[in-house]
Interface confidence: medium
């Protein structure tokens, strides 16, 4: 046992020696005047008046007695609906924003430690953001009968709509509902228009063939609380084969009447490749010959992203309102109340000051609404189907599908840099810069109003 | 401010015609829609059709199908409504209302979006007696 | 198409009274439900559209809930000036219809 003792003794020993010698000793504890041309350490601030390194107040606390000399910083817990993020000596706690109203829901309640963040609640999007949450929410348009959905609503883009393009319609008036194909008749009772679809009689319809276009399962956004049929195909992986020229199905989702003959077709090729492959095998352990592999590759060609969306024309702007990247943090002013946050950009992390969990407030419309040229949704389906037959007579089959499917999309995901935090220096200890809408607007790009004008030159067909 | 003015009442006789005119003023007629609606007498609101008046596409209510006529005058911001081979049922207060309304930007005839019958005509009576 | 029933036919109250008013659908709407208000001899005026977004111009005692196929109209606090027919409409699909309509009389 002496052995441990001796050990144990010793890792003490050196552990008081090591911060003996990380801090010398006439600065161990808070009051302490710094040694010239050195700064505070973490979680401590310099007090210009005592001119003393003094302790900061944690997380959910504020200085309720500034620290002298003699004496630290006394610090008392933030009283209801207020609260501070970070570790501060700011003499009143921050006030929680406003209730969310009655078009948002709160994601993250006010507590001693954190403000209260309201997002847009589903079928609305953020038409106006803050540092965090939104500041003014707006429904997402609806596009009536005779216009489909272009580009889907995210949380931070409104819903753009199109007219039906011949050979399709869309008889709602919604959201989230694209143009679909027409049904094709033997013969057709009622033609089908941009808000109709086509009435057959009595014999059993076919869905039209819309070129290249392949009806893919829609992913679950994890990003965006309101869910939402996409016009683009999506990337989720599919066990479905997709087939460069099958007929597309309504997009609303029956692909019943889709999967069943494809399943048909797959089955009996596969049977087929199966059969040629076996009696292959027997033909040629029979004439003692080397054995087989046959592979076969059926591949299915990258489908262009405009064919497999429907062309997207130039309706495709961006019209976000984006709030400007804001890194400073809400404690930036002890006086107030009312979001206080002015973005401050490319000023270096002060040392020993803990990092705001903020981060950066992005406007981003996440995959769905990247650039323009963005949407370049790639999908990739291979079957591959090897036969081989081996030496002893009993003939080795198999076959392997693959499924593939890439998504050049890519969603903007900076992280932020250079983060500045408020109170690392004596020179920016109470800085009050106010958060105005006109900042917030700084964008060139306008978002329409519900109702606009439309340009000059633009005259009825 | 935004109004829409429809033409006077009408007397027509059972298989004749009538076309409803309705003004409007206020605003830019070309980037809404117009909606026509009926009330028979004593009676409920009836949805008849709708014409974008950027392009002049229509939506008729089935039951009408065939015997309704919407129709726009651009130069006049004016829509037309007319209806054909009347019958005594036909008798009904019509309304004109504007009904939806494109996006602005360059591309504002690719925008469509629904807003509700938001400006009402003061209605037209067509009384429809032999 | 979808029809739309309204409940209750006809409602008599007092002035300051709640008044609330509903709407069935015969399938499923989302949210595409508006609520209208026609005073005798005048043209039909939008109350509420999508369900349960207000109108500018349109006092604040009138507001509507709902999606799917159940909504309602509610009249918070009545006034004189409130007696009319209201009817709900939906623009779900097409034909666009309306709801057979609820008289409100002041007692």
């Known amino acids: 046992m002496a052995p441990v003792a001796v050990w144990a003794a010793l890792a003490v020993g050196l552990e008081l020696w090591a911060a003996a010698h990380a801090l010398p000793a006439q600065v161990a504890f808070t009051p302490y005047a710094p040694e010239p041309g050195s700064t505070c350490r973490l979680r401590e601030y310099y007090d210009q008046t005592a001119q003393m390194c003094c302790s900061k107040c944690s997380p959910g606390q504020h200085a309720k007695v500034f620290c002298t000399k003699t004496s630290d910083t006394v610090c008392d817990s933030c009283e209801d609906s207020t609260y501070t993020q970070l570790w501060n000596w700011v003499p009143e706690c921050l006030s929680c924003g406003s209730r969310c109203s009655s078009d948002q829901v709160e994601t993250q309640a006010c507590t001693r430690e954190q403000n209260r963040i309201c997002t847009c609640r589903p079928g609305w999007y953020c038409a106006l953001s803050k540092q965090e949450g939104c500041r003014l929410c707006a429904p997402l348009r609806k596009c009536r009968p005779g216009f489909g959905v272009a580009r889907p609503g995210t949380e931070t883009s409104d819903v753009v709509c199109k007219p039906c393009a011949p050979g399709t319609f869309s008889n709602t008036t919604s959201s989230t509902d694209i143009c679909r194909p027409h049904q094709i008749c033997n013969v057709v009772a009622i033609p089908g228009n941009a808000s109709m679809d086509a009435v057959c009689t009595s014999t059993s319809p076919t869905r039209s063939m819309a070129p290249g276009a392949v009806h893919l399962p829609q992913p679950v956004s994890t990003r965006s609380q309101h869910t939402q049929p996409t016009p683009e195909p999506s990337t989720a992986p599919s066990t479905s084969f997709l087939l460069p020229m099958g007929p597309s199905p309504p997009a609303e989702g029956s692909t019943g009447d889709f999967a069943l003959p494809v399943g048909l077709i797959v089955g009996v090729t596969a049977l087929g490749l199966l059969i040629i492959g076996v009696v292959n095998c027997v033909i040629m352990t029979q004439v003692k010959k080397k054995p087989l592999c046959l592979q076969r590759e059926a591949k299915v060609p990258h489908l262009p992203a405009d064919k497999a969306r429907g062309t997207q024309g130039p309706e495709q702007q961006h019209l976000l309102i984006t709030a400007p990247s804001s890194s400073s943090s809400s404690l930036e002013s002890s006086a107030s109340a009312l979001d206080r946050r002015a973005p401050t950009r490319n000023q270096p992390q002060a040392p020993g000051v803990e990092a705001s969990g903020a981060g950066e407030a992005r406007a981003s419309t996440g995959s769905s609404d990247s650039s323009p040229g963005g949407h370049g949704t790639q999908v990739n389906v291979t079957c591959i189907v090897n036969v081989c037959s081996s030496s002893d007579h009993s003939s080795q089959c198999s076959s392997q599908a693959s499924s593939t499917m890439g998504d050049t999309d890519s969603s903007p995901s900076e992280s932020p840099k250079d983060e500045q935090v408020p109170f690392s220096k004596e020179e920016c200890a109470f800085r009050s810069q106010l958060e105005t809408p006109e900042t917030l607007l700084g964008s060139t790009e306008e978002k329409p109003l519900p109702l606009g004008v439309p340009d000059a030159g633009m005259k009825p067909s | 401010q935004v109004q829409l003015v429809q033409s006077g009442p009408e007397v027509k006789k059972p298989g004749a015609s009538v076309k409803v005119s309705c003004k409007a003023s206020?605003?830019?007629?070309?980037?809404?829609?117009i909606s026509w609606v009926r009330q028979a007498p004593g009676q409920g609101l009836e949805w008849m059709g709708w014409?974008?008046?950027?392009?002049?596409?229509?939506n008729y209510a089935q039951k009408l199908q065939g015997r309704v006529t919407m129709t726009t005058d651009t130069s006049t911001s004016t829509a037309y409504m007319e209806l054909r081979s009347l019958r005594s049922d036909d008798t009904a207060v019509y309304y004109c209302?504007?009904?939806?309304?494109?996006?602005?930007?360059?591309?504002?005839?690719?925008?469509?979006?629904?807003?509700?019958?938001?400006?009402w005509g003061q209605g037209t009576t067509v009384t429809v007696s032999s | 198409e979808i029809v739309l029933t309204q409940s209750p036919d006809f409602q008599s109250m007092t002035p300051e009274e709640k008044v609330t008013i509903t709407c069935r659908a015969s399938?499923?709407?989302?949210?595409?439900l508006h609520w209208y208000q026609q005073k005798p001899d005048q043209s039909p005026k939008l109350l509420i559209k999508?369900?349960?977004q207000s109108i500018s111009g349109v006092p604040s005692r009138f507001s509507g809930s709902g999606s799917g196929t159940d909504f309602t109209l509610t009249i918070n606090s009545l006034e004189a000036e409130d007696a009319a027919t209201y009817y709900c409409?939906?623009?779900?699909?097409?034909?666009?219809?309306f709801g057979p309509g609820t008289k409100v009389d002041i007692k």
């Open positions: 209302a504007r009904d939806g309304g494109y996006g602005s930007g360059t591309y504002h005839n690719d925008y469509y979006y629904y807003y509700g019958m938001d400006v």
């Open positions: 206020g605003y830019t007629f070309t980037n809404y829609g």
């Open positions: 014409i974008n008046a950027y392009n002049g596409n229509t």
């Open positions: 399938q499923s709407i989302g949210s595409n």
């Open positions: 999508f369900a349960s």
């Open positions: 409409h939906q623009s779900s699909s097409l034909p666009f219809t």
